[in-house]
C-alpha cells in the first residue's frame, strides 16, 4: 500500500476546521475490516485518530477530530480536525495497513491575522520640531509572530531607535507592541506594518503630524 | 489460538520503578491494539492505555500519564507497560488485553504488583 | 470522562432465574461490551457490540441498548454464572469500565 499527502503544509486559520489529506489505493475487493488506519503526532506517536478492525475508535485528541468514514473505502484517509488551536501546530503522520503498510507525514501550520494597527502618541500635545517623540504601533491577536517595519512619510526604512515586543497571549496568540523614538521634525507621516509571514496579510497603521493638531488618517 | 503470557509477581519499594511484560502468539501481533488495565485489590477495572505495535501510535489515560510508559518489541511479540514513582496505590493486579473491535477481547493471566517498604 | 455506572452493585439470586444488570452512561456510547470476570481470574469477553456473543459464550447471555442505557441479561441462571459482571465503552478516551456488579448465590 502507498500512502500518499500533501507535500505543502496545510494552513489553517485559528477557530476554523482544517482537513489533513491522506490517500491510498486500495486493490480490488478491499474491505474496511483490512484497514488499519492511524493518524499520529509525528514526534510523540501520540494518538490522534484511528480507524481499525472495521471501526473507527474516535478522537484520542481533543474529541476535535473525525475521518471520512464514507469515503474511507475509497482510500480517502483524510483527518478533520475542528477549531484549530495554536497548539494543533506540527505534523502528523498517517498510517495504513492493510497487508503491507505504509506512512507519510503532513505538517500543519497555525495562522490568525494581526488586528489593524492602533497609533499612540507620547507625548501627545504641545508638541514641537525637534522634540523627541515615542509612537507605539499594537496589533493583536495574530500568529505566527508577526515581522514589523516602519516608514516615514517618504517610504523610507526607519530602523534605529526601534523596540518590539510580542507577547502571547493564554491561546498562544500574539499581541505586538512596537515603539519607534523619533525626533519630530516640522512636519511628519509615520507608519507602521505588521506582517504575518505565513499568510502574507500586511496591517497597516500611521500617524501624521502637520503642526498643530496631531492628525490620525481615517481607519481604512 | 490467541494466548499472551504476562511476567510474574513482582513486589517493589516506593518511587521505585517497574515494567511489566506481555508475550502475543498466536496472531499478527502487529494488527492489533495492546492495552493496559489495573485491577487495585477487591477493586474494578482501570484502564491505563494502549499501544498500536505497527505504527508505535499509544494514548493513555490522564491519570497515568505521567508515570507510564507502554512500549513493544515487534521482534518479539513483546508488549511492556513501565510504570515509575511507585506507591502504595500502585499495588494491584495489571493486565494486558489485546483488542477485538471496541472490545479487549483477549486478557493476560495478570501480573500480580505490590508496593511495599 | 464518560463515566458507567452499573445496577445493582450486588445482585443475589438462585439458579435458574432471569436477572437484568444496567448499565448507564453519562454520555451517549455507540456500544456497549459486557466482560464477566471470576475471583482469582482475568476478565473474559461476553458481548460486544451492545448485543453480539463474543466466541463460546451460552446463548442465554443477551445485550441490548443503545444511547445511555445499556443492559445485559441471563435468562436463566446457571451455577458458573456466579461472577462479578462489569461493562465498558470505547466511545471516548480514556476507555472506562462501570465499576462491577457482584452476582451472588441467593
Known amino acids: 500500500v502507498e500512502v500518499q499527502v500533501s507535500e505543502d503544509p496545510v494552513v489553517a486559520l485559528v477557530d476554523t476546521d482544517a482537513t489533513l489529506r491522506c490517500s491510498f489505493s486500495p486493490e480490488p475487493g478491499f474491505s474496511l475490516a483490512q484497514l488499519n488506519l492511524i493518524w499520529q503526532l509525528t514526534d510523540t506517536k501520540q494518538l490522534v485518530h484511528s480507524f481499525t478492525e472495521g471501526r473507527d475508535q474516535g478522537s484520542a485528541y481533543s474529541n476535535r477530530t473525525a475521518l471520512f468514514p464514507d469515503l474511507l473505502v475509497q482510500g480517502n484517509a483524510s483527518l478533520r480536525l475542528q477549531r484549530v488551536r495554536v497548539t494543533d501546530e506540527g505534523s502528523y503522520t498517517c498510517f495504513v495497513s492493510i497487508q503491507d503498510f505504509d506512512s507519510a507525514a503532513v505538517s500543519l501550520q497555525v495562522a490568525a491575522p494581526y488586528s489593524k494597527p492602533s497609533m499612540t502618541l507620547e507625548p501627545n500635545k504641545d508638541l514641537r520640531p525637534g522634540n523627541m517623540v515615542t509612537i507605539t504601533c499594537s496589533s493583536y491577536q495574530g500568529y505566527p509572530e508577526a515581522e514589523v517595519f516602519w516608514k516615514d512619510g517618504q517610504g523610507v526604512p526607519l530602523t534605529g531607535n526601534v523596540t518590539t515586543s510580542q507577547m502571547a497571549n493564554e491561546r498562544g496568540l500574539f499581541d505586538v507592541h512596537s515603539v519607534l523614538r523619533v525626533v519630530l521634525g516640522a512636519n511628519g507621516t509615520y507608519s507602521c506594518l505588521v506582517r504575518n509571514p505565513v499568510l502574507q496579510q500586511d496591517a497597516h497603521g500611521s500617524v501624521t503630524i502637520t503642526g498643530q493638531p496631531l492628525t490620525f488618517p481615517p481607519e481604512a | 489460538q490467541v494466548q499472551l503470557v504476562q511476567s510474574g509477581a513482582e513486589v517493589v519499594k516506593p518511587g521505585a520503578s517497574v515494567k511489566v511484560s506481555c508475550k502475543a502468539s498466536?496472531?499478527?501481533?502487529?494488527?492489533?491494539?495492546m492495552h493496559w488495565v489495573k485491577q487495585a485489590p477487591g477493586q474494578g477495572l482501570e484502564w491505563i492505555g494502549m499501544?498500536?505495535?505497527?505504527?508505535?501510535?499509544?494514548n493513555y489515560n490522564e491519570r497515568f500519564k505521567t508515570r507510564v510508559t507502554i512500549t513493544v518489541d515487534k521482534s518479539t511479540s513483546t508488549a511492556y507497560m513501565e510504570l515509575s514513582s511507585l506507591r502504595s496505590e500502585d499495588t494491584a493486579v495489571y493486565y494486558c488485553?489485546?483488542?477485538?473491535?471496541?472490545?479487549?477481547?483477549?486478557w493476560g493471566q495478570g501480573t500480580l504488583l505490590t508496593v511495599s517498604s | 470522562d464518560i463515566q458507567l455506572t452499573q445496577s445493582p452493585s450486588f445482585l443475589s439470586a438462585s439458579v435458574g432465574d432471569r436477572v437484568t444488570i444496567t448499565c448507564s452512561a453519562s454520555?451517549?456510547?455507540?456500544?456497549m461490551y459486557w466482560y464477566q470476570q471470576k475471583p482469582g481470574k482475568s476478565p473474559k469477553l461476553l458481548i460486544y457490540?451492545?448485543?453480539n456473543l463474543a466466541s463460546g459464550v451460552p446463548s442465554r447471555f443477551s445485550g441490548s441498548g443503545s444511547g445511555t442505557e445499556y443492559t445485559l441479561t441471563i435468562s436463566s441462571l446457571q451455577p458458573e454464572d456466579f461472577a462479578t459482571y462489569y461493562c465498558?465503552?470505547?466511545?471516548?478516551?480514556?476507555?472506562?469500565f462501570g465499576q462491577g456488579t457482584k452476582l451472588e448465590i441467593k
Open positions: 488485553a489485546r483488542s477485538t473491535a471496541l472490545a479487549t477481547g483477549y
Open positions: 498466536g496472531y499478527t501481533f502487529t494488527n492489533y491494539w
Open positions: 499501544i498500536h505495535p505497527n505504527s508505535g501510535a499509544f
Open positions: 454520555s451517549s456510547v455507540s456500544y
Open positions: 457490540d451492545t448485543s
Open positions: 465498558q465503552q470505547w466511545s471516548s478516551y480514556p476507555l472506562t
